[in-house]
C-alpha cells in the first residue's frame, strides 16, 4: 500500500535540457497567467486526475504484491500452479480487492462511475471483436488498459 517511489507512468515526460536561467517557461509565464493557470484550473486538473490516479494506484498495488509474492516463494507457487490464486489472496482485504468487489456488487454501477463504464465497454468490445484503436487511445489516456486487461483475465470478473 506504499505510495513511495511509485513512478507516474500514466503521464508522458520529456527531460528538459534547457538551462534554468534561460527557461522558456519563465518567458511564457505572462501568457500562462493570462490564460489562467490558478486554483480553479488546478481544481479541474485534480478532478481529471482523480480517476486516473486511482487506477494507477490499483495497478501499482498489484505490481507490488506480485513482486512481494515472487520474492517470497515464486518457485514453489509456480511449481504448484497456485500463482494466480496466491495473488488473489494477497489482494484479499486490500483496497484493490475492496474496489473490485464494490464494482462487482453493483454499488459502483448504480453511481455510474467511469471505471465501470470502461470495464464493461472493454468487455463488450472484446466479446464482439470490435476493440478499436479509439478505445485503445482512451484507455491509454486513462492509464487503465493494463489494469482492465488484468481484471478481465482474473476470476474477479466472474462476478461470483
Amino acid at each position: 500500500r506504499s505510495l513511495q517511489d511509485t513512478e507516474e507512468k500514466s503521464r508522458s515526460f520529456s527531460a528538459s535540457q534547457a538551462d534554468p536561467l534561460s527557461d522558456p517557461d519563465q518567458m511564457n509565464e505572462d501568457k500562462r497567467h493570462s490564460q489562467g493557470t490558478f486554483t480553479s484550473d488546478y481544481s479541474k486538473y485534480l478532478d481529471s486526475r482523480r480517476a486516473q490516479d486511482f487506477v494507477q494506484w490499483l495497478m501499482n498495488t498489484k505490481r507490488n504484491r506480485n513482486n512481494i509474492a515472487k520474492r517470497h516463494d515464486e518457485f514453489e507457487r509456480h511449481a504448484e500452479g497456485t500463482f494466480t490464486s496466491d495473488v488473489s489472496s494477497y489482494l484479499e482485504g486490500q483496497a484493490a480487492k475492496e474496489f473490485i468487489a464494490w464494482l462487482v456488487k453493483g454499488r459502483g454501477r448504480r453511481d455510474f462511475p467511469e471505471e465501470v463504464a470502461i470495464v464493461e465497454e472493454l468487455g463488450r468490445r472484446h466479446a464482439d471483436g470490435s476493440f478499436s484503436d479509439e478505445m485503445n487511445t482512451i484507455l491509454d489516456n486513462l492509464a487503465a488498459r493494463d489494469f482492465i486487461n488484468w481484471l478481465i483475465q482474473t476470476k474477479i470478473t466472474d462476478r461470483k
Partner: antibody, heavy 119, light 112 residues
Framework: QVQLVESGGGVVQPGRSLRLSCAAS????????MHWVRQAPVKGLEWVAF????????FYADSVKGRFTISRDNSRDTLYLQMNSLTPEDTAVYYC????????????WGQGTLVTVSS | DIVMTQSPDSLAVSLGERATINCKSS????????????LAWYQQKPGQPLKLLIY???IRESGVPDRFSGSGSGTDFTLTISSLQAEDVAVYYC????????FGLGTKLEIK
C-alpha cells in the same frame, strides 16, 4: 532514500526577487509532479505551486499568481521557484514536496528554506 | 477552498495512553466513484521534514507504525495513536487532497 534539499532562502526587501531551488535525489525525478508549500507562523501550511513531471501543467495559489513561477530541470533533478514582487506576507519557510502517485498528496518533503521579506 | 479545522490545538497525553486528534473539512472529501476519502495526515517533528502517515483517511503509509490509525468519512476524521511513545511528540496536520490542497492548522502533541 528520497531526499529533497531546498536552498536560496534569505532576507530580502519588499518588492525584490528571490529564486529558490530544490535538489532531488533517491527517486526518478522526471516521473513525478512536484510542489512548493510554505509555512508561515500565522497562516500555517499553505500550498503555493505545482508543476507536472513533463512541465505541461503548472498551477499557482491565488495569493502568488502573477508573481511566482515554478519550473524544473529534469536533467538536473532540480525544482525551482522564482519569486518576484515579494511582500512581507510571503515570509515563510518554503518546502518542496514530491507528489505521490495520487495527485496533491505529498509523500516526501524537504527540510525547508526560510524566506524573510522585511525592510 | 476547502477549510480544514483541527482540534484540539494542543494535546498532552501520558506515555502508553491513547491520543486522538480530530479534523473537520468544510465540505465532503469523499469521492463517490471509488468510495475513498481524500484526507491525509502528516507528522512534523522539530528540525525534520514533514512525514506522510495516513492517506485516503485510513491507509497507513509504508513504514508507519501500526499504533497510528486513521478513521472517518465525509467531513469528519480522526487520527488515533493507540499507545503514545516518546518519539510521537510532534505537530500533526490533516490535509485534504480532493481539490486544491489545504491543511489544518495543526495539533501539537506533548507528553503529560
Amino acid at each position: 532514500q528520497v531526499q529533497l534539499v531546498e536552498s536560496g532562502g534569505g532576507v530580502v526587501q519588499p518588492g525584490r526577487s528571490l529564486r529558490l531551488s530544490c535538489a532531488a535525489s533517491g527517486f526518478t525525478f522526471s516521473t513525478f509532479g512536484m510542489h512548493w508549500v510554505r509555512q508561515a507562523p500565522v497562516k500555517g501550511l499553505e500550498w503555493v505551486a505545482f508543476i507536472s513531471n513533463d512541465k505541461n501543467n503548472k498551477f499557482y495559489a491565488d495569493s502568488v499568481k502573477g508573481r511566482f513561477t515554478i519550473s524544473r530541470d529534469n536533467s538536473r533533478d532540480t525544482l525551482y521557484l522564482q519569486m518576484n514582487s515579494l511582500t512581507p506576507e510571503d515570509t515563510a519557510v518554503y518546502y518542496c514536496a514530491k507528489e505521490s502517485i495520487l495527485a496533491a498528496l505529498f509523500d516526501y518533503w524537504g527540510q525547508g528554506t526560510l524566506v524573510t521579506v522585511s525592510s | 477552498d476547502i477549510v480544514m479545522t483541527q482540534s484540539p490545538d494542543s494535546l498532552a497525553v501520558s506515555l502508553g495512553e491513547r491520543a486522538t486528534i480530530n479534523c473537520k473539512s468544510s465540505q465532503s472529501v469523499l469521492y463517490s466513484s471509488n468510495n475513498k476519502n481524500y484526507l491525509a495526515w502528516y507528522q512534523q517533528k522539530p528540525g525534520q521534514p514533514l512525514k506522510l502517515l495516513i492517506y485516503w483517511a485510513s491507509i497507513r503509509e509504508s513504514g508507519v507504525p501500526d499504533r497510528f490509525s486513521g478513521s472517518g468519512s465525509g467531513t469528519d476524521f480522526t487520527l488515533t495513536i493507540s499507545s503514545l511513545q516518546a518519539e510521537d511528540v510532534a505537530v500533526y496536520y490533516c490535509q485534504q487532497f480532493y481539490t486544491v490542497p489545504t491543511f489544518g492548522l495543526g495539533t501539537k502533541l506533548e507528553i503529560k
